[in-house]
């Protein structure tokens, strides 16, 4: 028979979990793990199960996004009696199993973190020997990726009536505050667009009317750092063009 269950227990246990006759399926994961972009994170996951001393074939799986249906980011399989879980899938080669599934530990290391990794992850184990059973974390662990600001685009664009406007887009977590400085501007917070749908870490600030030639600097700052980039506006007076 095959059973798919959802867990009710999802608290981080720091101790290794071993089966006893009365144990049921459960998974222990922390609600959230935080790490900086570019660094590594560990997604802890331990489990208990009712199949005492199970040493048959098993598969360990991690998904992203949603339980049961989300895309797999990691999968490994251990043969009967083997302590080695052979990796079959590691998305972009950045997911590595730290735990030993034979010791009820599916903990995963994620390397070279990017802001796009900021999502929820779900661990799952499948037994496929004499016993056929499987279990998956329902609530999962949220990986919160933080990042110092990075300006991803800065540009000057034409606007109606031979005027020009400047756009600055930056990413970071927490989302950075943007400020423009330049000729006759002082420090201006400008018009900041809220993060775009599906681009939660991107913030854009617009300077709607550039009235003077010269250097315009966009500064992005959050609690982890700051970044700045500049554009230059030189208009050919008497003509409708500009050099930036």
């Amino acid at each position: 028979f095959v059973r798919t269950k959802i867990d009710t227990t999802e608290n981080l246990l720091n101790t290794e979990v071993h089966s006893s006759p009365a144990q049921r399926w459960s998974m222990q994961v922390p609600p959230e793990v935080s790490a900086e972009a570019g660094d590594a994170a560990v997604l802890p996951c331990t489990f208990t199960h009712p199949h005492r001393h199970y040493d048959g074939p098993l598969t360990a799986i991690w998904r992203a996004g949603e339980p049961y249906a989300g895309p797999q980011v990691f999968r490994c399989a251990a043969a009967r009696g083997s302590e080695l879980c052979q990796t079959a899938l590691s998305l972009h080669g950045r997911f590595r199993l730290l735990g030993n599934p034979r010791r009820n530990d599916l903990s995963l290391r994620v390397e070279r973190l990017a802001l796009a990794d900021d999502r929820r992850y779900f661990c799952r184990v499948e037994f496929a020997g004499d016993v056929h059973d499987r279990y998956e974390s329902r609530h999962g662990v949220r990986l919160h990726v933080t990042a110092a600001p990075r300006i991803v685009n800065i540009s000057v664009l034409p606007s109606p009536a031979h005027a020009f406007r400047a756009l600055c887009t930056a990413e970071g977590e927490p989302p950075p505050a943007l400020a423009w400085s330049g000729p006759a501007l002082g420090n201006s917070l400008a018009a900041v667009r809220s993060p775009r749908e599906g681009h939660g870490h991107l913030v854009t600030a617009e300077l709607p009317a550039l009235t003077h030639d010269g250097r315009y600097t966009c500064t992005a700052a959050n609690s982890l750092g700051r970044s700045e980039a500049s554009v230059y506006l030189f208009r050919f007076h008497g003509a409708s063009g500009a050099s930036t």
Epitope: L12, N14, P30, V33, A35, D39, A40, A41, V42, L43, P44, L84, Q86, T87, A88, L89, S90, G93, R96, L97, L98, G99, S107, R109
Partner: antibody
Amino acid sequence: EVQILETGGGLVKPGGSLRLSCATSGFNFNDYFMNWVRQAPEKGLEWVAQIRNKIYTYATFYAESLEGRVTISRDDSESSVYLQVSSLRAEDTAIYYCTRSLTGGDYFDYWGQGVMVTVSL
Amino acid sequence: DIVLTQSPALAVSLGQRATISCRASQSVTISGYSFIHWYQQKPGQQPRLLIYRASNLASGIPARFSGSGSGTDFTLTINPVQADDIATYFCQQSRKSPWTFAGGTKLELR
């Protein structure tokens, strides 16, 4: 029984190059990452390079102090790993060990007996 | 790079407890996992893995060896010390690349 055997060491002149080889047996080579670690005479250990396996796209990593002068490679069909070192300097004189590591951990669970490389006029 | 520091030598008596320390220049622990590993090296031999991830005994290593610690401070304990344990002991970190070793602690008989 896991066996790791390094060859290719010897005396090399400064500025020269050499290729170290590491033959393995007793385990499924494809399932592991392979590394080179060196130890200068009467000194500590220094990690040199790592090559991951096929699932991990044969990614390579190098110690900054050697970047650009070393290349690690592997041949899964031969269960072997290689280290090419160029522009050799006196400070590259060391015992070079070939080591195995699990895909989940950058620690070295098996080591070869090492091969001596001496860089001298 | 993460710098690991060990004291160069430790004198012990046979049958006693030996405690070898390793200090990291920054934390090597993430979410309860400590990326510190211990090796033993005898003269003329290759190193041998003793402990991985701070406290896990490697295959075939006697139970008199144990490891502990978290964050930046780690300890390898040998209890009781036997004559066969006279060697140099190295810690290594894999928290961040490049993976680095400490200079080693030479265990000597008092």
